[in-house]
């Protein structure tokens, strides 16, 4: 995608496919032909790794091989030889260089003295045509150190310790075509240092400490085609014609410097420049006429700079441009007509740019565009005429579906059904468990309501996935910015937070009663209701604050298709990031730690009291039941929250987290608690089991009575629900004695154990 990649990857070339260009088959907007057959397929099915056409046509020519590589591959064919183990072409010809240092290798007229601890340029026969002195200890290049090598064509000096180069160091190298000085410590190049290098075509000075260059630096380089100054410390380019002494310069690579701005005169003499790479600099300002002289420019790479504003007509003279990279710039706004003049553009990279005013009008004039790259795959909908649009998924959604994975599309319904049904069932069953402990029941119903919201959230996501099925991309941007998405996202957070806070509250109540039985004060109705109200209010506040301040939180819930703010992106506002961390690694992590600690302490406390009990075997059995129950409560909490904490923590450390993680977390991990809470806190408890048992017993009785024609009297289910203090000695079963689990503290220590089975 970038020009630099030409250096490191051998490109595969092919014909380029532009919308409708040169094809007999005409397809409607957003559709592209399957080669020479009449079938047309939508954008999202082209270049997706699947043979949808049936003749591979939709997967042909998908590589983005635009840019200089197409025209100038011949200049790079030998670059790869240089990076191989030996820079020699023939297999193993005999050495034709008369005198060769013992530690060097020689084949034909080419000499390889790599990694031989040389401290100076060796003296060899003058007929040498290539000399590789890489990875040595050369510190300086004195005058005339290459004077006799009139036939030398390639000189490799990478990875030495060169700090100074004499102005006459390269004198006599009249045949030199390629000079590599990368990975040294060069701070300055004296004007005229390259004066004798009239045939030099490549000059590569990557990874040095050059802080300034001026036109006279390159005096004598009339044949230079490629100049690579990557990864130096250049802060500015001269306000004079840079290419004054390099009239044939085609490729200028200034990636990874510290250049702040580009001046109007810099490129005035660079009329033959075909590729200009300026990525990873600190460019913050561009003048309207900066690129005006570059009328032959084929590739312009300005990615990863600090550009905030693009002058409206900055690209107006770049009629030949086929590849433009503006990725990862803090560009505030792109003009609707910004790209109008780029009629030959084939590849446009806008990754990492939030295009708030995105519209089809921006890309419509780019009729030859075959590849486009955005920050969000949702933007692809605004360039329907471009065959290859990336990204085509954010890991959650794809161009076709809100939920990219078929597993997720199915399970969103399964999990939401289980969650809703389980919780509604418990809510409905509560009146039948006529507990004296109304306050505890109220807390459980509250928990079920919160968990039910998670089921509703998943139902809504599933519903919109169905609604957008097959054409999600058309609606993606609008959906993520919609009120529906904001509300459904806040519903998920409300559910999560209320559930977490309620579980913490219930756990702390039990903890105090079990661990400090004699300090246990019976919580009044008023206090319990107050706590429940406070928990719900807190949940609402946490969930709805991001909706109240768009400026601060941006589109907090709409960062992905499932509207759940799990991990922050780099471009998300700092406020949103802090807020998200405060929820997940603040409130929720603290709650999780409290729950784990409380259950651990409770079990320890019960275990300690059980040691004094006499019926050892019975106690061990009960202890195991208790341990099992506690383990499942803590385990499901851990199962739900540990992955979320890990994801959040990693995103905080700026570890790249695949988008797929969010959807799997939302559909399979986040609802674990919501789905299992009714089972853990109600459906598996003894009161519930007994109630079911009595229902069943009563039903059987009634049947047998009916068959005998007798009237049935159902027993009233009046018993004390004290989950998790369920097993009571009959003599203590008095309604007035237990109105809350706390009061169990009056029971002897050994009885405490019974109460948890």
């Amino acid at each position: 995608m970038t020009s630099g990649s030409v250096f490191f990857y051998i490109l595969i070339f092919g014909k380029y496919f532009s919308h409708g260009g040169g094809q007999d088959v005409k397809c409607s907007l957003g559709y592209f032909p399957c080669g020479n057959i009449t079938k047309c397929l939508p954008q999202l099915l082209h270049c997706n790794g699947v043979d949808d056409c049936g003749n591979q046509a939709d997967e042909d020519n998908c590589g983005d091989n635009n840019g200089w590589s197409l025209q100038f591959d011949k200049y790079f064919a030998s670059y790869y030889k240089m990076t191989s183990q030996y820079p020699f072409e023939a297999e193993t010809p005999e050495c034709l260089v008369g005198s060769v240092p013992v530690q060097c290798l020689c084949q034909g007229l080419e000499l390889d003295c790599d990694e031989t601890n040389l401290r100076a340029v060796p003296s060899v026969s003058s007929n040498v045509t290539a000399m590789s002195l890489q990875w040595n200890l050369i510190r300086k290049l004195p005058p005339d150190c290459f004077k006799n090598y009139h036939d030398l064509q390639k000189l490799y000096l990478q990875n030495n310790k060169i700090t100074s180069i004499s102005i006459y160091a390269f004198r006599g190298l009249n045949s030199l075509t390629k000079l590599y000085l990368s990975h040294n410590r060069i701070t300055f190049l004296k004007p005229g240092v390259f004066e004798d290098l009239h045939r030099l075509e490549w000059l590569i000075i990557e990874d040095n400490h050059l802080s300034r260059i001026s036109p006279p630096t390159f005096y004598g380089l009339n044949s230079l085609i490629l100049l690579v100054l990557m990864n130096n410390v250049l802060t500015r380019l001269p306000d004079k014609p840079l290419c004054q002494h390099m009239p044939r310069l085609h490729w200028l690579d200034l990636e990874g410097n510290h250049i702040h701005n580009l001046r109007n005169l810099t490129f005035i003499s660079c009329s033959n420049l075909t590729v200009l790479v300026m990525r990873k600099n600190k460019i913050n300002h561009l003048n309207e006429n900066t690129f005006a002289p570059l009328q032959k420019l084929d590739e312009l790479d300005l990615g990863s700079n600090k550009i905030e504003n693009l002058p409206p007509l900055i690209f107006k003279d770049l009629k030949e441009l086929s590849q433009l990279n503006l990725s990862y710039n803090p560009i505030q706004k792109i003009q609707a007509n910004q790209f109008d003049y780029l009629v030959k553009l084939k590849s446009l990279s806008l990754e990492g740019i939030e295009i708030s005013n995105i519209q089809q009008r921006m890309f419509r004039p780019l009729m030859n565009l075959s590849h486009i790259y955005f920050k969000k795959f949702q933007y692809c909908g605004y360039a329907p005429h471009v065959r290859s649009c990336k990204p085509n998924t954010d890991g959650i959604s794809s161009l076709e579906n809100l939920l990219a994975s078929i597993i997720q599309r199915v399970f969103v319904w399964v999990v939401s059904a289980v969650t809703c049904f389980g919780n509604i069932f418990v809510i409905c069953m509560r009146p039948y468990i006529r507990s004296e402990n109304k306050l505890y029941a109220m807390s459980i119903i509250s928990l079920c309501c919160a968990d039910c919201l998670m089921g509703i959230y998943l139902f809504v996501i599933g519903g919109f996935d169905l609604k957008f099925r097959g054409e999600y991309n058309k609606h993606a941007q609008l959906w993520m910015e919609s009120t529906h998405c904001q509300l459904v996202g806040s519903l998920a957070i409300l559910s999560t937070e209320v559930s977490v806070l309620l579980l913490t509250f219930l756990t702390l109540e039990k903890y105090i009663c079990i661990v400090y039985p004699f300090r246990c004060v019976r919580p009044g109705k008023c206090r319990t209701i107050t706590v429940l109200i406070l928990i719900w209010i807190t949940g609402f506040i946490v969930a709805f604050i991001p909706l109240s301040n768009k400026e601060f939180f941006k589109n907090y819930y709409g960062t992905n298709g499932v509207c759940f703010p799990l991990h922050s992106e780099d471009t998300e506002s700092i406020g949103a990031q802090i807020y998200s961390v405060a929820i997940f690694l603040g409130i929720n992590l603290a709650a999780f730690i409290i729950i784990v600690f409380s259950y651990g302490s409770m079990f320890y406390s019960v275990h300690q009291s059980a040691i004094t009990a006499t019926e050892i075997r019975n106690q061990v059995k009960k202890e195991m039941i208790l341990a099992k129950r506690f383990f499942f409560i803590v385990f499901t909490d851990a199962l739900c929250w540990i992955p979320i904490f890990v994801v959040k923590f990693l995103s905080l450390l700026q570890v790249e987290i695949p988008g797929t993680i969010t959807s799997w977390v939302v559909i399979f991990i986040l609802p674990i608690n919501s789905a299992l809470n009714p089972i853990l806190y109600t459906l598996t408890t003894r009161p519930f089991k007994e109630m079911i048992h009595r229902f069943w017993y009563n039903y059987r009785q009634r049947k047998s009575m009916d068959s005998k024609g007798q009237k049935t009297y159902a027993p009233s289910f009046i018993w004390v629900e004290m989950w998790p203090l369920q097993e009571m000695p009959p003599e203590l079963m008095k309604p007035d004695l237990f109105t809350y689990p706390c009061e169990m503290s009056l029971i002897s220590q050994s009885t405490r154990l019974n109460s948890y089975s």
């Epitope: 030996y86 297999e91 193993t92 013992v102 530690q103 290798l105 020689c106 084949q107 003296s123």
Partner: antibody
């Protein structure tokens, strides 16, 4: 233990070609940064370097015999070969093969016991 | 080509004597000089490499010195088994060259 063993004809006629073999045992001839040399010593005279082949296959010859000599190798058999064309009585000598670490100044650390050649009509 | 000149073809010595053999290079070879010992009917043996480094197993009575163009090989106390021909060799650049040899014999 590294051993080098030269073999070849004892007597050949002038103008014929000489073929010598050096079998290396206990060490790979393709080991990085090692070269394998042929050196000869005419009766009662000093040592003369004839040429070398290095680990990656590069070959170097003494200018005095360059036009009529060829060094080659068989990496699978771990053998070094030396061929000298159009021999004369001047080529009567003891022929040695030796190993050299490809670092300036290290010299020839292992030698074969040598093979004697007499050129006679 | 670099020419290595050993000024003495023969050197007479007695057991226990100190003897020095010199070698001169026609151009700068830094310290890339090796010394060999050859006894009648045997292959040469490496004694000294890189001008002054003793090869493994070589007795410490054998020493070498020098750099640039002038090199010296010394036997601090000659033993009867040291009677042999000694060659210097430049191991700096191809073609590799030897000195003509110095024969050490008893007085």
């Amino acid at each position: 233990q590294i051993q080098l063993k030269e073999s070849g004809p004892v007597v050949i006629k002038p103008s014929q070609s000489l073929s010598l073999t050096c079998i290396v045992s206990g060490f790979s001839i393709t080991s990085s940064r090692f070269c394998w040399n042929w050196i000869r010593q005419p009766p009662g005279k000093g040592l003369e370097w004839m040429g070398r082949i290095c680990y990656e296959g590069s070959r170097y010859y003494s200018p005095s015999i360059k036009s009529r000599s060829t060094i080659s190798r068989d990496t699978s058999l771990n053998k070094i070969f030396f061929q000298l064309n159009s021999v004369t009585s001047e080529d009567t000598a003891m022929y040695y093969c030796s190993r050299e670490k490809q670092i300036a100044g290290t010299g020839f650390d292992y030698w074969g016991q040598g093979t004697t050649l007499t050129v006679s009509s | 080509d670099i020419v290595m000149t050993q000024s003495h073809k023969f050197m007479s010595t007695s057991v226990g004597d100190r003897v020095s053999i010199t070698c001169k290079a026609s151009q700068d070879v830094s310290t890339a000089v090796a010394w060999y010992q050859q006894k009648p009917g045997q292959s040469p043996k490496l004694l000294i490499y890189s001008s002054s480094y003793r090869y493994t197993g070589v007795p410490d009575r054998f020493t070498g010195s020098g750099s640039g163009t002038d090199f010296t090989f010394t036997i601090s106390s000659v033993q009867s088994e040291d009677l042999a021909v000694y060659y210097c060799q430049q191991h700096y650049s191809t073609p590799l060259t030897f000195g003509a040899g110095t024969k050490l014999e008893l007085k």
